[in-house]
Amino acid sequence: HNTTVFQGVAGQSLQVSCPYDSMKHWGRRKAWCRQLGEKGPCQRVVSTHNLWLLSFLRRWNGSTAITDDTLGGTLTITLRNLQPHDAGLYQCQSLHGSEADTLRKVLVEVLADPLDHRDAGDLWFPGESESFEDAHVEHSISRSLLEGEIPFPPTS
């Protein structure tokens, strides 16, 4: 899997999209996990609804939300109030039994807020030693979600 880079501004929301083949992954719940080290496990952050037919309902864990358009084949993760510590390597996963298929590897980069004049020294960027030569950058500027807003997929 290539790694897709999503860049967001500190303090704002970042929306990550993971497209997939809806028929291949029919009936499967999805998850968003954080890679712990290059070879380490991927720690679950949030997963879609327990009932696959309700995957369109936005599920939250802290400041991270997940919603799945199972008909269109797009998993969407929202990181609200992006912080420097949110930067790192993640995966979108498709779950089946105790197994998980990787849909997309995602590198989240947190950019300094241009309106914030504090020291940006604690912001994380991939260093030269890290190999993301296969990565392609996808700038994602997302609006803040309205409170209680729920996206529902079409049923026809």
Partner: antibody, heavy 126, light 106 residues
């Protein structure tokens, strides 16, 4: 008039099978998710399971206590949803209701159920 | 699994009274909560969805509020036809109902 009518209830022995029907009228049946609920005598409501709209190709979900025993299906040509109940237990005794998942104005569905049938009684006893 | 605790289990009030029923979830369910009314011998009827949205055709004396774990259902002025059992139902985890609140007239 939008309407759901259940049928097929009755007295059945433990371990036997029964099939309930829910006949819909007054709306485009294929556009809606359909659900089954039950209510044991003098008790509260319990979700049994549901089936997605036509777009979801008959995909179903069930509560844990009936998984593997009950099967929900739908016949779009007849506008009927079915609940096939196998290996019935005495604790399955209840009034069974079918209900329609709410549909948003802009064509999306919602797990709130806005139309219900009158219910059909299922008694499991030897 | 989520537990939905409704209180009180029953109440008696006079016509015109303000009636309040609470529903507490054992964990955060955002606003994924519906309220139903069930009259004796009848099927349930949807009153409120998404914790606070009034279903079409339902009288405005019924209302719902809350988010997270604590939710409230209110009848602003109790009417004789409101005699029923009221249920909350979450859809954050599965589709779990509260135990119901039976409302009677004094």
């Amino acid at each position: 008039e939008v309407q759901l009518v259940e049928s097929g209830g009755g007295l059945v022995q433990p371990g036997r099978s029964l099939r309930l029907s829910c006949t819909a009228s007054g709306f485009t049946f294929g556009d809606y998710a359909m659900s089954w609920f039950r209510q044991a005598p003098g008790k509260g409501l319990e979700w049994v399971g549901f089936i997605g709209s036509k777009a979801y190709g008959g995909t179903t979900e069930y509560t844990a206590s009936v998984k593997g025993r009950f099967t929900i299906s739908r016949d779009g040509s007849k506008s009927i949803a079915y609940l096939q109940m196998n290996s019935l237990k005495t604790e399955d005794t209840a009034v069974y209701y079918c209900a329609r998942g709410k549909r948003r104005d802009y064509g999306y569905w919602h797990p709130a159920f806005d139309v219900w049938g009158q219910g059909t009684m299922v008694t499991v006893s030897s | 699994d989520i537990q939905m605790t409704q209180s009180p289990s029953s109440l008696s009030a006079s016509v015109g009274d303000r009636v309040t029923i609470t529903c507490q979830a054992s964990q955060d369910i955002t606003n994924y909560l519906n309220w139903y009314q069930q009259k004796p011998g009848k099927a349930p009827k949807l009153l409120i969805y998404d914790a606070s949205n009034l279903e079409t055709g339902v009288p405005s004396r019924f209302s719902g509020s809350g988010s997270g774990t604590d939710f409230t259902f209110t009848i602003s002025s109790l009417q004789p036809e409101d005699i029923a059992t009221y249920y909350c139902q979450e859809y954050d985890q599965y589709l779990t109902f509260g135990g119901g609140t039976k409302v009677e007239i004094k």
